[in-house]
């Protein structure tokens, strides 16, 4: 059960949102909806797995309601008509709080996990292969919707690996309600990989602001800086690394380093004081020649959120910012598997790292 190609995540899409699920639903597909329940207006939100954009054919309607003590409705809509509701009378969501909502498509049902605990299973009433669209509406703000394609599961899966894993790419920032992720580069078939999503949470009461998101006073996922993590298996052609975060309003510089032992194989260094994105390699504490050319203006902006996708290819790294290809960096250290450490530091707040 191996599927090639990958679906780009939708980053900070506006709600109401509708987006295409490339290739439709597959047995083993995992879809993660990450966001925050709005604390103000509205008592409901919904995630729909549907055919097309009309909303008349919804294979799975997942509908938390902050009414009557809180409950979640699950249902199916066929030709505009709703079937019998299935209600779960426990509410795992909290108003004003972030959530991590994961859907696993399986042959007999959808399994739904909320905040790390299995919440409900919803048995298919219509063939799930018909589903080609995900929509989200209601009193919710989205951080991202990501997709992990089914993969052959190891006989003895370790707890720290992903059984259904595939590198993903960032699309351009969503601009409309109906979005089809074009992908930045062609999605090449990739080998079975481990994808590790590193997640942390900031201290309660921390202010966190992005252009699309008003300041919020709840614990928002954010990383201690500097952030250092291992890249399991190191780099290899088709390996993807994804980061998202927010540039601090007073930022001078930040850096993303891919390291091999004491060497920095790839140093990505946006400098706001120079209005430049500097790239370089450091070997035995000696820097090489800088690369600074860009096809367009500086993509990082003080006070604004960003996403970076680093795709390793045989001869170079391809780097995209906010879904747009920015530059290629030809390998100077060519022993790719030894490049196995990611270091991020400087004047940013990280919100998502996937290696």
């Amino acid at each position: 059960m191996a599927f090639s190609g990958s679906q780009a995540p939708y980053l900070s899409p506006a709600v109401p949102f509708s987006g295409t699920i490339q290739g439709g639903l597959q047995d083993g597909l995992q879809i993660t909806v990450n966001g925050t329940v709005l604390s103000s207006s509205g008592t409901r939100f919904a995630v729909n797995f549907q055919t097309g954009f009309s909303g008349n054919d919804i294979a799975f309607h997942f509908n938390p309601r902050f009414e009557d003590g809180g409950y979640v409705v699950c249902n199916t809509r066929q030709n505009g008509s709703w079937g019998p509701e299935e209600r779960k009378t426990h509410m795992p969501f909290q108003k004003g709080m972030p959530f991590d909502l994961c859907f696993l498509v399986q042959s007999s049902d959808f399994k739904v996990m909320v905040n790390g605990i299995l919440f409900v299973q919803y048995f298919h009433r219509v063939p799930f292969h018909r589903v080609d669209t995900i929509s989200v509406n209601g009193s919710v703000q989205l951080s991202y919707i990501s997709f992990q394609n089914p993969r052959t599961v190891p006989v003895q899966p370790a707890f720290s690996t992903v059984p259904f894993s595939q590198p993903v790419c960032f699309p351009p920032r969503p601009r409309g309600r109906r979005q089809k992720p074009p992908g930045v580069w062609p999605a090449n078939p990739a080998p079975i990989t481990q994808t590790v999503i590193h997640t942390v949470q900031s201290a309660p009461g921390q202010m966190f602001s992005t252009p699309a998101i008003p300041p919020m006073m709840y614990p928002h996922p954010a990383y201690p800086m500097p952030f250092i993590t291992t890249i399991l298996g190191g780099l290899y052609p088709s390996k993807s690394i994804l980061l998202s975060g927010t540039v601090l309003p007073s930022a001078q510089r930040f850096h993303i380093n891919l390291c091999s032992g004491n060497h920095i194989a790839f140093h990505l260094n946006p400098r706001f004081d120079e209005n430049a994105v500097v790239r370089n390699t450091q070997i035995d504490n000696s820097w090489g020649s800088e690369e600074r050319s860009l096809p367009r203006k500086m993509p990082f902006v003080r006070g604004q959120s960003f996403s970076v996708w680093i795709l390793c290819e045989a001869h170079c790294l391809k780097v995209a910012v906010d879904g747009q290809h920015l530059f290629e960096y030809y390998h100077r250290l060519r022993n790719l598997p030894t490049i196995n450490r990611l270091e991020v530091g400087g004047d940013i707040q990280l919100t998502h790292v996937q290696t």
Partner: antibody
Amino acid sequence: EVQLVESGGGLVQPGGSLRLSCAASGFTVSSSSIHWVRQAPGKGLEWVAYIYPYSGYTSYADSVKGRFTISADTSKNTAYLQMNSLRAEDTAVYYCARYSTYSSKWVWGMDYWGQGTLVTVSS
Amino acid sequence: DIQMTQSPSSLSASVGDRVTITCRASQSVSSAVAWYQQKPGKAPKLLIYSASSLYSGVPSRFSGSRSGTDFTLTISSLQPEDFATYYCQQSYYDSNPITFGQGTKVEIK
């Protein structure tokens, strides 16, 4: 190597407070849900609370709701259990355990446990 | 709350015996069930996760199965180191998202 180490247990009078710590190594607490489970002398396992640091979500057993607070400091890679208004029936060995990492969330089980810390509530 | 009714509460068996322990959930919990082994003075150890998957490093004589809301832990050939207490545990979101069975003490006959 993944490891969980509890500390902070001890003897406390009824109505008193204790704060238990669960220091993690070999993984980040933010990529898992962290649970506290207790075991009274000669009794079975009882789930107490959990935190999913990625979203900040917490949940408690009815028996401790309003008295215990679970939290996590991701910069210290440590989870905590603040226990207030302690009662004699809270006497137990308290374990922290890791439940399914973020990246393998469809795997259901607590794969790593600490050695436990004894809390005795007695006058 | 979802109740996990575990039986028997204790059993006596000999080395080489086939041992079966069952847990019945009071409502559907999908496959979100794990089995643990605990020895006196020690923390529990995970044996089976997701109802039927053998955890890494656990001997293959341990197996788990599911039939509806009934879950079974089987030790195909009991070994001396297997004398311990065994617990089932469900993690399906309810008022208490985690509940354990009462435990089964496996003793030497």
